[in-house]
């Protein structure tokens, strides 16, 4: 009778003999910033060290009565979910607890910052193996909280946080909104987003993935062998902290970027019922439920990519939106999306020595999103080749002309307000895989990359009749790096990657009065690295 | 996830160095920004994190904190330095009246100041 949540995160090959994956996480130290905990609970006894750190505000109310079991309840439960003997994810992981939340579960940004500094100082004084920091808390958006998280992450620490229980955009909360932090939303046994009273799990582009967060059995501070069911995004974050500890124990050299990509890669895809989310957040919210890797195998041979959405540009005419990849990731392609369809495309730009994806709003548009495809590719070297608007009926084209460079993505950007008034181009002629084709009024940008053994191919899926959505997926063994629409007419809302599938969205054709001539094609660029495959074969 | 120009309340004070006539005062027209939680009930006025510019030397955190205390005292305000940060961000945590924000934002090396706010178990 394994708890549902442990079963959910466990790949099928472990399930034959109940939940008995390797007692992982033993090389990893997990720091828990929460309430006080009951360290002599049988679930966590001997595997948790209570640090002397405490920075908490006074409890509210004059009549507040401190009761040890209540003060310890939140932290004890989470410690049990991370590494509990029976109901824990990473049964081998060591835990260190810092008290930053009082008996009412309330703390301060400043107290938590001091806690994060305590961790950094400990790391400097006595460097150990991989560190995971679990922040099962949330406050309003805080620049300083996010900045501190960024610094700690850049010092090699993996931070995992709760998305928040406010049934709201996670980007409005910290540390959930910090890009360097792994932000976790909560789902239930039915793979529905968790409802908590009148509220529920947060959502949106600041969430990295979801994990079990309803009716989660874990250590109860009521007695030293008691268990209790609790719900929340804290519980979900604790699962991911446990999975991260398992992965880092198997591969201690993993960087934060590699770990995040693996968490996404091994997640269950497209199982969450998105109807629960507000309509405008569905496309931004990742449909991913965390899971352990199918074994402690080294997944280094894969080309990992993820999709990163920008903040909304806002509606002003010259508004732009910028999507950025993490420090160790490479931006392989850039696309854009607008709900109104009024946009002026996108392009890759250099900013502070890093490539970013910038999308441009159009006059009368409600705003745009930039969508970056961020990948892990060792020794990669990319450049952007641009062709100005051709003005010719064949459309604008650009290709990768440098030796050894392959096409990883196509972007197009136009100055005219409405491409719809201009004749669309024909589809790209076959047999020219290294070429981007776009509207004759648009400048076209090809992302051309060189990396050992990197090979890419273009996959197109065109539908003769107008459709609201056209999709094209990469085959097994190939990873989607680029996703763009053909042609660039006004009824195309944009293109974006969902896992290994390229999605091109068009306006509801019944309302636009479009003709069947305005057919849409989705162009996917699928890549793999022979170099990485060979490296993995040598390992085996 | 979220860029630093995210959806939170920002009060920008473009302040020129004045009366204190400090040798290392900010260059003409330099701006430090003030931030506070957009969710009013979660605000904790009276406690502020003063964040210094990234390249600031670690000894500068104490020096800036002391300078703030001295200038506040000259105006008849009591302040208390609760913590000095060294290992993550250069800066310090200070308990003071909100009346001193304008003064604090003019201090050399200050990048931004954020009012403390609550966080909650999830």
């Amino acid at each position: 009778s394994i708890p549902w949540n442990l079963e959910r995160i466990t790949p099928a090959r472990y399930r034959a003999d109940e939940y008995q994956p390797p007692k992982g996480g033993s090389l990893v130290e997990v720091y828990l910033l929460d309430t006080s905990i009951q360290s002599d609970h049988r679930e966590i006894e001997g595997r948790v060290m209570v640090t002397d750190f405490e920075s908490v505000p006074e409890e509210d109310g004059t009549r507040f009565h401190r009761q040890a079991s209540k003060c310890d309840s939140h932290g004890t439960h989470l410690a049990g979910v991370v590494s509990g003997r029976d109901a824990g994810v990473a049964k081998g992981a060591g835990l260190r607890s810092l008290r930053v939340l009082n008996c009412q579960g309330k703390g301060t940004v400043s107290g938590t910052l001091i806690g994060l500094e305590f961790i950094r100082k400990s790391q400097l004084v006595q460097p150990v193996g991989p560190l995971v920091v679990l922040l099962p808390l949330a406050g309003g958006y805080s620049r300083v909280f996010n900045a501190a998280c960024q610094r700690l992450a850049r010092a090699g620490v993996v931070l995992v946080t709760a998305a928040g229980n406010f049934r709201d955009d996670a980007c409005l909360y910290s540390p959930a909104s910090a890009p360097e932090v792994i932000t976790v939303g909560a789902t239930n046994a039915q793979d529905q987003p968790v409802t908590l009273g009148t509220l529920g799990t947060n959502f949106g582009r600041c969430v990295d993935l979801f994990a079990p967060g309803e009716d989660i059995i874990g250590a109860s501070s009521d007695c030293s062998t008691c268990f209790v069911s609790r719900s929340g995004t804290s519980q979900a974050a604790a699962h991911v902290a446990g999975i991260a500890a398992m992965m880092l124990s198997a591969e201690p050299e993993l960087t934060l970027a590699e770990l995040r990509q693996r968490l996404i890669h091994f997640s269950a895809k497209d199982v969450i019922n998105e109807a629960w989310f507000p309509e405008d957040q569905r496309v931004l919210t990742p449909n991913l439920v965390a899971a352990l890797p199918p074994s402690t195998h080294r997944a280094g041979w894969q080309l990992f990519c993820r999709t990163v959405w920008s903040a909304h540009s806002g509606p002003t005419r010259m508004a732009t939106a910028v999507a950025r990849c993490a420090q160790d990731e490479e931006l392989l392609s850039c696309s854009s999306f607008s709900r109104s369809g009024k946009r002026r495309g996108e392009r890759i730009e250099a900013q502070g020595g890093k490539r970013v994806c910038r999308a441009h709003n159009a006059f009368g548009g409600e705003g745009v999103y930039a969508i970056a495809r961020c990948c892990l590719l060792p020794q990669v070297n990319c450049s952007v080749h641009t062709a100005p608007p051709a003005g010719a009926s064949m459309g604008t084209r650009v290709h990768c002309h440098q030796q050894g460079h392959v096409l990883t993505g196509c972007s197009s950007h136009w100055e005219v307000e409405d491409l719809g008034t201009h004749k669309p181009p024909v589809l790209r002629p076959r047999g020219q895989p290294n070429q981007c084709v776009g509207h004759r009024e648009a400048s076209i940008h090809a992302s051309c990359c060189h990396a050992p053994g990197l090979e890419c191919k273009v996959k197109e899926h065109g539908i003769p009749a107008p459709q609201e959505q056209v999709i094209v997926a990469c085959e097994d063994g190939w990873t989607l790096t680029g996703c763009s629409p053909l042609p660039g007419t006004s009824h195309v809302l944009g293109a974006y990657a969902v896992d290994n599938t390229c999605v091109v969205r068009s306006r509801d054709v019944s309302t636009t009065g479009s003709t069947s001539k305005e057919a849409v094609a989705a162009v996917a660029i699928c890549c793999r690295s022979r170099h990485l495959v060979q490296a993995s074969q040598e390992l085996q | 996830q979220e860029d630093e120009d995210g959806d939170y309340e920002e009060l920008v004070l473009a302040l020129r160095s004045e009366e204190d006539g400090l040798a290392d005062a900010p260059e003409h027209g330099a701006t430090a920004t003030f931030h506070r939680c957009a969710k009013d009930p979660w605000r904790l006025p009276g406690t502020y994190v003063v964040v210094l510019k990234e390249e600031t030397h670690r000894s500068q955190s104490e020096r800036t904190a002391r300078r703030l205390q001295a200038q506040a005292a000259r105006r008849g305000y009591l302040t208390k330095i609760l913590h000095v940060f060294h290992h993550l961000l250069p800066g310090f945590l200070v308990k003071m009246s909100g009346d001193l924000l304008e003064l604090a934002l003019k201090l050399p090396h200050v990048d931004y100041i954020e009012e403390d706010s609550s966080v909650f178990a999830q």
Epitope: H41, R42, A87, C223, C226, F227 | -
Partner: antibody
Framework: QVQLLESGGGLVQPGGSLRLSCKAS????????FSWVRQAPGKGLEWIGY????????KYNQKFQGKATISRDNSKNTLYLQMNSLRAEDTAVYYC???????????WGQGTLVTVSS | EIVLTQSPATLSLSPGERATITCRAS??????LNWYQQKPGQAPRLLIY???NRATGIPARFSGSGSGTDFTLTISSLEPEDFAVYYC??????????FGGGTKVEIK
């Protein structure tokens, strides 16, 4: 080796009270806590309460709150069970057992029979 | 309050046969469940702790398994001295110590 020896049982009038003793030997007395458990004739085991000799802290089964009092004398390595307002249904064999809270009751005394009858 | 339900209440078997007793908890208890044996006129004695660990001096024919809510005590081949009453036990918040109703293993 570890030994627990109960005493103090016997015949008690209804409404009366009794004090049972349990002397421990063979280990450090204050390192473990103790439970009192009773068993009515032909019935199962029923837990009464426990004491931590180190701190003197006690916990009781709600059913025995106010009726039973557990105490200890560390100098004598002995713990006690005081039972008041006894009724016929309190007739049982009373056992003391050594434990570590959250673990098992690893050593038991031989038991002492208490009969409540007029 | 956790309720422990033992089944069967009585088990009639012959020496040499295999005995299987189950204990079901009304809520999740992890692996923190213990088994005791009580012979007539004697005090209970600890057999198995933490669901599957044999206590000191307990013969190998006794084994425990299970976790969560469903637990099993197995006696692989009954010896004459094994005919007794068996109890399962867990810890809880109130009351802290909870026993199952007992299973009597009798000679057929």
């Amino acid at each position: 080796q570890v030994q627990l020896l109960e005493s103090g049982g016997g015949l008690v009038q209804p409404g009366g009270s009794l004090r049972l003793s349990c002397k421990a030997s063979g280990y450090t007395f204050s390192s473990y806590s103790f439970s009192w458990v009773r068993q009515a004739p032909g019935k199962g085991l029923e837990w009464i309460g426990y004491i931590d000799p180190g701190s003197g802290g006690t916990k009781y089964n709600q059913k025995f709150q106010g009726k039973a009092t557990i105490s200890r004398d560390n100098s004598k390595n002995t713990l006690y069970l005081q039972m008041n307002s006894l009724r016929a249904e309190d007739t049982a064999v009373y056992y003391c057992a050594r434990q570590r809270v959250g673990y098992s009751l690893d050593y038991w005394g031989q038991g002492t029979l208490v009969t409540v009858s007029s | 309050e956790i309720v422990l339900t033992q089944s069967p209440a009585t088990l009639s078997l012959s020496p040499g046969e295999r005995a299987t007793i189950t204990c079901r908890a009304s809520q999740y208890v992890g692996s923190y469940l213990n088994w005791y044996q009580q012979k007539p006129g004697q005090a209970p004695r600890l057999l198995i702790y933490d669901a599957s660990n044999r206590a000191t001096g307990i013969p190998a024919r006794f084994s425990g398994s299970g976790s969560g809510t469903d637990f099993t005590l197995t006696i692989s081949s009954l010896e004459p001295e094994d005919f007794a009453v068996y109890y399962c036990q867990v810890w809880d918040s109130s009351p802290p110590v909870v026993f199952g109703g007992g299973t009597k293993v009798e000679i057929k």
